[in-house]
């Protein structure tokens, strides 16, 4: 047990105010009542506490709320949020978007990606799903934060909010996240015309299956190389040279620049060299003419 601390009578704290900045660490420990601190959390951010003093205040709150802080406290954490670890945040139950906004503002300019990701996760859990209001808050206050959510959390996104997602919001999304978001986007944009549909679906295509890419190749979409490079390797490999040519349109020349990078490199290795030669780009590494391609995976599946 920690050595018992007694507050000197002249140092007793009856309210959280600026006088506390003159308290030594031990005095803060002994004299600040955690419940009083919790009740007056809204005052803390206006007081220029040192980092060491903020540590004491955090320990006070941890001691009072071992199962995680209530939202009334979380909402007013201010710069004390910078002291929180993902483990601390994982204990929270947050439902208010005002709380989320306040803490996202505080975290700006600080290396807190893990904490922010955990906070967003707790908000989604607290609200039951990633609803439109939450998504709007994320896009406004934390572009790219959508991608900090796990695929499991993203699965709760209703297709109706996909339209509010901007391309830059998906920049940091990984393949597993796009796998979840793509079908929702496809559903959300299904009634749009060809060119309009492609503009909307483009940022989500990292989750598209081969069949959908084949279908797009029939629509003269002229996919840019940056989008093509973000496609799933498994989805690109089965595409024929003709399908890729149609898919990229005038951008097909970019394949030469990317021929050493996945998924282009892997796709080249799967194509017949004479088919690649029809592109006139000098792409090398295809299957030499006269070679027979045995797809052993199909044979294994049949046996």
């Amino acid at each position: 047990d920690v050595e018992r601390t007694t507050c000197p009578p002249e140092k007793e704290v009856h309210e959280i105010d600026e006088s506390l900045i003159f308290y030594k660490k031990r005095e803060l420990e002994a004299c600040v009542d955690a419940a009083l601190l919790a009740a007056q959390m809204d005052r803390v951010d206006a007081i220029p506490f040192t980092y060491e003093q903020l540590d004491v205040l955090k320990h006070k709150l941890d001691e009072l709320y071992p199962q995680g802080y209530p939202e009334s406290v979380i909402r007013h954490l201010g710069h004390l949020f910078l002291k929180m670890s993902p483990e601390d945040i994982r204990k929270w139950n947050v439902t208010s978007l005002e709380t989320l906004k306040a803490l996202l503002k505080v975290s700006k300019g600080h290396e807190m990606s893990a904490q922010v990701a955990t906070l967003i996760d707790r908000v989604v859990v607290g609200r039951g799903q990633l609803d439109k209001d939450t998504a709007d808050t994320l896009t406004a206050f934390c572009p790219g934060c959508l991608c900090s959510l796990s695929p499991e959390r993203l699965s709760s996104v209703p297709p109706s909010i996909i339209g509010a997602v901007r391309p830059q919001d998906l920049d940091t999304c990984g393949p597993r996240q796009l796998d979840v978001l793509y079908p929702k986007a496809r559903l959300a944009f299904q009634n749009m015309s060809g060119s309009e549909y492609f503009v909307k679906i483009r940022p989500f295509l990292g989750g598209a299956p081969t069949e959908d890419l084949k279908a797009l190749s029939q629509q003269n979409v002229s996919m840019d190389l940056a989008t093509f490079m973000k496609l799933r390797r498994e989805a690109v490999l089965p595409l024929s040279v003709a399908e890729v040519q149609k898919l990229l349109g005038p951008h097909v020349e970019g394949l030469k620049v990317e021929e050493q990078h996945s998924p282009v490199r892997d796709w080249i290795l799967k194509q017949r060299q004479d088919d690649l030669d029809t592109l006139g780009l000098g792409l090398q590494g295809g299957i030499p003419n006269g070679y027979l391609i045995l797809d052993l995976s199909v044979r294994e599946a049949l046996s």
């Epitope: 047990d1 920690v2 050595e3 018992r4 601390t5 007694t6 507050c7 009856h14 309210e15 420990e29 002994a30 009542d33 955690a34 419940a35 009083l36 919790a38 009740a39 320990h59 006070k60 001691e63 009072l64 709320y65 071992p66 199962q67 209530p70 009334s72």
Partner: antibody
């Protein structure tokens, strides 16, 4: 099931000392703020003292400050109240109570132990 | 310290009637830190209401709390025989915790 069991009460002369104990079970004592509350015969409730779980930070009512000391042994899940310089007006049933920070209230109470200060 | 004054001191009512108990604070109390307790003779107090209006576990819905600032109320919508007891309000921020002097609800 949360249980708080006070002991150590009895008859003591004015100026004397007594140590009350409260054995806690059924919850994580090491995470919990604890309090002592007393009730003089036929009177209302009076909060006496409180202690935090880890730092053992203490607070007292003015009426007992300097005479009573609250402490805890987290290894034994036990809360104590050391009462010195006892006065007739300290005669009361002393209750040990658990403070629930999430409710900001004393949500579990012991059955109390009677302290009588008399010559 | 915050002084809590309860009124009336005694309330004489019959089973089935509505009881309204008042608790007034000498200065503003955050509703999050206002609680009500019930105590029967020879027993320890029991938490009824916390946060001014939330019922504690196992407390029947005939008990309700309301109020903010300096005025708080405990209401028992229909008195049952087991409700005749003494009721205390309490504030828990800041220290010292203080209790009201109690309201006795007795059978008329």
């Amino acid at each position: 099931e949360v249980q708080l069991l006070e002991s150590g009460g009895g008859l003591v002369q004015p100026g004397g000392s007594l140590r009350l104990s409260c054995a806690a079970s059924g919850f994580t004592f090491t995470h919990t703020y604890m309090s002592w509350v007393r009730q003089a015969p036929g009177k209302g409730l009076e909060w006496v003292s409180a202690i935090s779980p880890t730092y053992s930070t203490t607070n007292y009512a003015d009426s007992v400050k300097g005479r009573f000391t609250i402490s805890r042994d987290n290894n034994k899940n036990t809360l104590y109240l050391q009462m010195n310089s006892l006065r007739a007006e300290d005669t009361a049933v002393y209750y040990c109570a658990r403070y629930n920070a999430y409710h900001a209230a004393l949500d579990y109470w012991g059955q109390g132990t009677l302290v009588t200060v008399s010559s | 310290e915050i002084v809590l004054t309860q009124s009336p001191g005694t309330l004489s009512l019959s089973p089935g009637e509505r009881a309204t108990l008042s608790c007034r604070a000498s200065q503003s109390v955050s509703s999050s830190y206002l609680a009500w307790y019930q105590q029967k003779p020879g027993q320890a107090p029991r938490l009824l209401i916390y946060g001014a209006s939330s019922r504690a576990t196992g407390i029947p819905d005939r008990f309700s709390g309301s109020g903010s600032g300096t005025d708080f109320t405990l209401t028992i919508s229909r008195l049952e025989p087991e409700d005749f007891a003494v009721y205390y309000c309490q504030q828990t921020v800041p220290y010292p915790y203080t209790f009201g002097q109690g309201t006795k609800v007795e059978i008329k």
